[in-house]
């Protein structure tokens, strides 16, 4: 398989465009949060619907030459190396959380009489850190519905609320599949909390809404696109453990123009740390609280993996021999609070801030839409992945 | 087809030891639970041990608890017994039984061996006899 | 622990004659997790009802289960000649235990 860091810039920028066509938005999500939950429902799925959902692990090429020819036990071997890559990202994650408030959580919630295998239920703990948990569709099915949304609450430290609306589940649902991350992150530096102004931040060339910008001057990892009149900049949290990357436009409006110019071999290549250069910069960054949700079954059946999601054609196998089993409701959703907290300077660093455009430094304004991502560095893995257009 | 095929049993004085085996086929074997439950003579059924699809968890009854071991080796499609400190009363005929591989949300959170799984396919049995 | 109590211990019916068999638990059997199994003499149990009424694959439809908490019931509609034999209830919820049986015999 592909490593983590490639399939998720590849699934979190494929994503991203198909989520573009009905979103004018912000639009936000976590390409690893969702490729976990795509690897716990590959793991209990077999056959075509298997399939579909491999291909998610396999670059384009890899996919039409040897595998499609390969054997039934090498297909297995292949998915198991995925899951292993996710336990071991998920383990190395969670020693993460003494400098951030980073969860990724999954959890299936099941129809308490519907017989599951058990061998599947004890795979997804041991790979996803995912449990399962009994509630009563059949007989409550409002009653577990508000149980979903006030567990999903009390994992957003109450920010997200209402995931799961009236109605959206029914008495015949089986199966619920709750992807979900947090992040609540300190900068490797902090900005400094009365630098903070109030701003307009342009959505277009007539519209504005006002923002608190935050802002800092120091050196970060930098790079031009000429071809694209953009810029990408690199914001490390703290030790360096995960990083934020902000692509904006020299336009207001030349996001749109240039999203089909970029692709996520090009989102590689451009972040890494042979193309950037450190730099000194004066950031302009607005002090932001994200938060989506969205219902993947008719995105990612838009991507190419509909039998997941199909209640003729899904096959759940590998999750239950009970036969109709299919995920009727995967729901992702993520949260990510930019401030100004970070690691305090060190006061014999003195660095002092001037608003003025010293000679050599790079200005980076994002007071109008940009695309932004945030990467664990170890993995290469992105973590987030989104358009901020609309404060 | 499916089939659990037995092995080991046979008459061994009290305070002896027997290892019975189960070899199955048919079936993907490490997907699914295996039990022991026997039979003693013109007696009902009594389930003996359990052990889940990995080997990792296993259960006994409380008559043969400390006495009786039970394991599998799935790369062999297998199940054993080992039976120490035979007594009188294990005198029964054995079976090994496939556990059902489903289980409903509740009971695997329970994490007891054979709960909330039936039997839905039985060896041939062999027989125990413990008699001095 | 729960003790499965069957009865009647014996029951001499016809062929073509209904099969009324009753097993009662000394606590509720938690998720109606009751299964019934028939055993013809040197052969071993097959499972015929599992979840307390739910069929077991290739069993003909004379056969039904039902009931919940601590009564339950095995129903065979039409007895045929394969039918005589020793049925066993069984508590897979919490304890395992199987009932005593009830032989059904030709009358």
């Known amino acids: 398989m592909d490593s983590l860091g490639a399939v998720s810039t590849r699934l979190g920028f494929d994503l991203f465009k198909e989520l573009k066509k009905t979103n004018d938005g912000n639009i936000f999500f976590s390409p690893v949060g969702i490729l976990t939950a795509i690897g716990m429902v590959l793991l209990g799925t077999r056959g075509a619907t298997a399939s579909q959902l491999e291909e998610v692990f396999h670059s384009e090429k890899e996919t039409k030459s040897s595998r499609i020819k390969a054997e039934e036990k090498e297909v297995i071997e292949n998915t198991e190396a995925v899951h292993q890559q996710f336990q071991k990202f998920l383990t190395e994650i969670s020693k993460l959380t003494n400098d951030y408030e980073l969860n990724i959580t999954n959890r299936l919630f099941g129809e308490k009489t519907y017989l599951f295998l058990q061998k599947y239920l004890d795979y997804v703990e041991k790979y996803y850190h995912a449990s399962l948990e009994p509630v009563d569709f059949v007989n409550a099915a409002d009653e577990s519905r508000k149980k979903i949304n006030s567990w999903v609450e009390s994992k957003t430290n109450e920010k997200i609320k209402d995931l799961f609306p009236d109605g959206s589940i029914s008495s015949s649902t089986k199966l619920v599949l709750v992807n979900m991350v947090y992040f609540k992150g300190q900068w490797d530096r902090e900005f400094k909390k009365e630098n903070t102004k109030e701003e307009k931040f342009w959505m277009n060339k007539s519209t504005s809404k006002s923002v608190q910008m935050m802002t800092q001057s120091h050196s970060f990892s930098f790079t031009f696109l000429e071809d694209l009149q953009a810029k990408i900049l690199g914001i490390p949290y703290k030790n360096n453990d995960l990083s934020m990357f902000v692509l904006l436009p020299n336009d207001i409006d030349g996001l749109e123009k240039i999203i089909d110019k970029i692709s996520p071999e090009k989102l590689v290549e451009w972040t890494s740390p042979g193309h950037m250069e450190e730099r000194k910069v004066n950031l302009h960054l607005p002090r932001f609280e994200v938060e989506d949700g969205y219902d993947l079954e008719a995105v990612l059946a838009a991507m190419g993996m509909g039998d997941a999601f199909s209640e003729h054609k899904a096959d759940y196998s590998g999750m239950s021999s009970g036969s109709g089993l299919y995920a009727q409701k995967f729901l992702h959703s993520s949260f990510v609070a930019v401030t100004e907290e970070g690691t305090e300077a060190a006061a014999a660093t003195g660095i002092g801030f001037t608003v003025t455009s010293a000679p050599g430094h790079e200005n980076v304004h994002c007071n109008h839409p940009f695309l932004f991502f945030i990467r664990h560095n170890e993995s290469n893995s992105i973590l987030f992945f989104g358009r901020f257009s609309s404060p | 087809q499916m089939q659990l095929v037995q092995s080991g049993g046979g008459v061994v004085r009290p305070g002896g030891s027997l290892r019975l085996s189960c070899a199955a086929s048919g079936f993907t074997f490490d997907d699914y639970g295996m039990s022991w439950v026997r039979q003693a003579p013109g007696k009902g059924l009594e389930w003996v041990s359990g052990i889940n699809w990995n080997g990792g968890s296993t259960g006994y009854a409380d008559s043969v608890k400390g006495r009786f071991t039970i394991s599998r080796d799935n790369a062999k499609n297998s199940l054993y017994l080992q039976m120490n400190s035979l007594r009188a009363e294990d005198t029964a005929l054995y079976y090994c039984?496939?556990?059902?591989?489903?289980?409903?949300?509740?009971?695997?959170?329970?994490?007891?061996?054979?709960?909330?799984?039936?039997?839905?396919?039985w060896g041939q049995g062999t027989l125990v006899t413990v008699s001095s | 622990e729960t003790t499965l109590t069957q009865s009647p211990g014996t029951l001499s019916l016809s062929p073509g004659e209904r099969a009324t068999l009753s097993c009662r638990a000394s606590q509720t059997v938690s998720g109606s997790y009751l299964a019934w199994y028939q055993q013809k003499p040197g052969q071993p149990p097959r499972l015929l009802i599992y979840?307390?009424?739910s069929r077991a694959t290739g069993i003909p439809d004379r056969f039904s289960g039902s009931g919940s908490g601590t009564d339950f019931t095995l129903t065979i509609s039409r007895l045929e000649p394969e039918d005589f034999a020793v049925y066993y209830c069984q508590d897979y919820g919490s304890s395992r235990t199987f009932g005593q049986g009830t032989k059904v015999e030709l009358k």
């Open positions: 039984a496939r556990e059902s591989s489903m289980t409903t949300v509740t009971t695997y959170l329970l994490r007891e061996v054979g709960v909330g799984l039936d039997f839905d396919y």
């Open positions: 979840g307390a009424s």
